[in-house]
Interface confidence: low
């Protein structure tokens, strides 16, 4: 008799999830010498232990602490790039500017990027059929709690000038409900962080508006200023050209504003 299984509103665990996490861990530790000491089997065991046999709407940050401990990593605190709703460009940028880091350039972020996972209460099974949706089901699900935990730690580690890439094509360029708006902004440490510098990425070819004057950016500035952190904002009118010029600063087309 097939056992009754909870149907959630979100997609199920990514297929081959355990193999993917393990393979990513091995690849990451091979590429990053400072993480060569990490035992990937232990990392997987800690990851699995955070959500297996637990109700997928009842996950806590505490569940992820063994994984956090194993994945402890020091990145240069003044080289942190946050992003909101513009992940691909942020990752393209750090691939070119190798001394800058997004969360997904760290081991834990790299392991989980674009993956979904959840388990079931009281069974050791991974649920490949469905997982809780943050809005429709519950916020304390394995994926959301993981990203909240690692995002908080990443923001807490930042110092000096912190950069954030924001999507100028969205109706809310700064969204208080995004991970950046709800977690990272509030966990920057004013005693360490001098300035948050926002880069508003334009989408339109001929879009010459100053999106730094957008009401949501002004809201971000207000939140940051109240936290005793300076705020600055720059428009990146031509993201394609911006990336090209980061790669080849001497290119003749890089002598004007981007």
């Amino acid at each position: 008799v097939p056992r009754w299984r909870q149907q959630w509103s979100g997609p199920g665990t990514t297929k081959r999830f355990p193999e993917t996490v393990l393979a990513r861990c091995v690849k990451y530790t091979e590429i990053h010498p400072e993480m060569r000491h990490v035992d990937c089997q232990s990392v997987w065991d800690a990851f699995k232990g955070a959500f297996i046999s637990k109700h997928p709407c009842n996950i806590t940050e505490e569940d992820y602490q063994p994984l956090m401990k194993l994945g402890t990593q020091t990145v240069p605190c003044n080289k942190i790039l946050l992003w909101s709703r513009i992940k691909d460009l942020a990752h393209q940028f750090t691939q070119v500017q190798r001394d800058m880091f997004t969360l997904e350039d760290t081991l834990l972020g790299y392991l989980a990027d674009d993956l979904t996972w959840c388990g079931e209460f009281n069974t050791s099974k991974i649920n490949y059929q469905s997982c809780p949706d943050w809005r429709k089901d519950c916020s304390n699900n394995p994926v959301s709690v993981f990203w909240k935990t690692v995002s908080r730690r990443f923001a807490e580690a930042a110092c000096d000038v912190v950069h954030v890439m924001l999507n100028g094509s969205r109706s809310k360029i700064f969204d208080k409900n995004s991970t950046f708006g709800s977690v990272e902004v509030h966990n920057l440490q004013p005693e360490k962080v001098q300035t948050l510098e926002a880069w508003v990425i334009h989408g339109g070819r001929e879009d010459s508006r100053d999106l730094c004057q957008d009401p949501t950016i002004k809201e971000l500035e207000s939140i940051i200023s109240k936290r005793n952190i300076q705020f600055s904002c720059k428009n990146i009118y031509r993201p394609d050209k911006f990336l090209q010029c980061v790669k080849n600063p001497e290119d003749s087309s890089c002598t004007s504003e981007i």
Partner: nanobody, 115 residues
């Protein structure tokens, strides 16, 4: 915000030398010199990265030398064997990723080379 102030421009005879300075009010990464002759577009002269790597426009190679003093947040352009075609307003630029990265520009200093 970083302020950039150029100095050292002036009138010089062909074959002569000038040394331009660009003082930055804060820490910068990549810096560069650009120039704009009347009726022409702004062109790259030379850049220097945070690590000290330099690049030059073909037209100034062997004659101009870019350098920086990180302790003083100042960049220099030593211009030797000047030619009339070097006459332009010279601008200093600074940015985190490349000099013209929509970041900081100086007001410019006039260099005039007479024949």
């Amino acid at each position: 915000e970083v302020q950039l102030v150029e100095s050292g421009g002036g009138l010089v005879q062909a074959g002569g030398s000038l040394r331009l300075s660009c003082a930055a009010s804060g820490r910068t990464y990549a810096m560069g010199w650009y120039r704009q002759a009347p009726g022409k577009q702004r062109d790259l002269v030379a850049t220097i990265s945070g690590a000290g790597n330099t690049k030059y426009a073909d037209s100034v190679k062997g004659r101009f030398t870019i350098s920086r003093d990180n302790a003083k947040n100042t960049m220099y352009l030593q211009m030797n064997s000047l030619k009339p075609e070097d006459t332009a307003v010279y601008y200093c630029a600074a940015g985190k990723w490349f000099p013209a990265a929509n970041e900081y520009w100086g007001q410019g200093t006039q260099v005039t080379v007479s024949s």
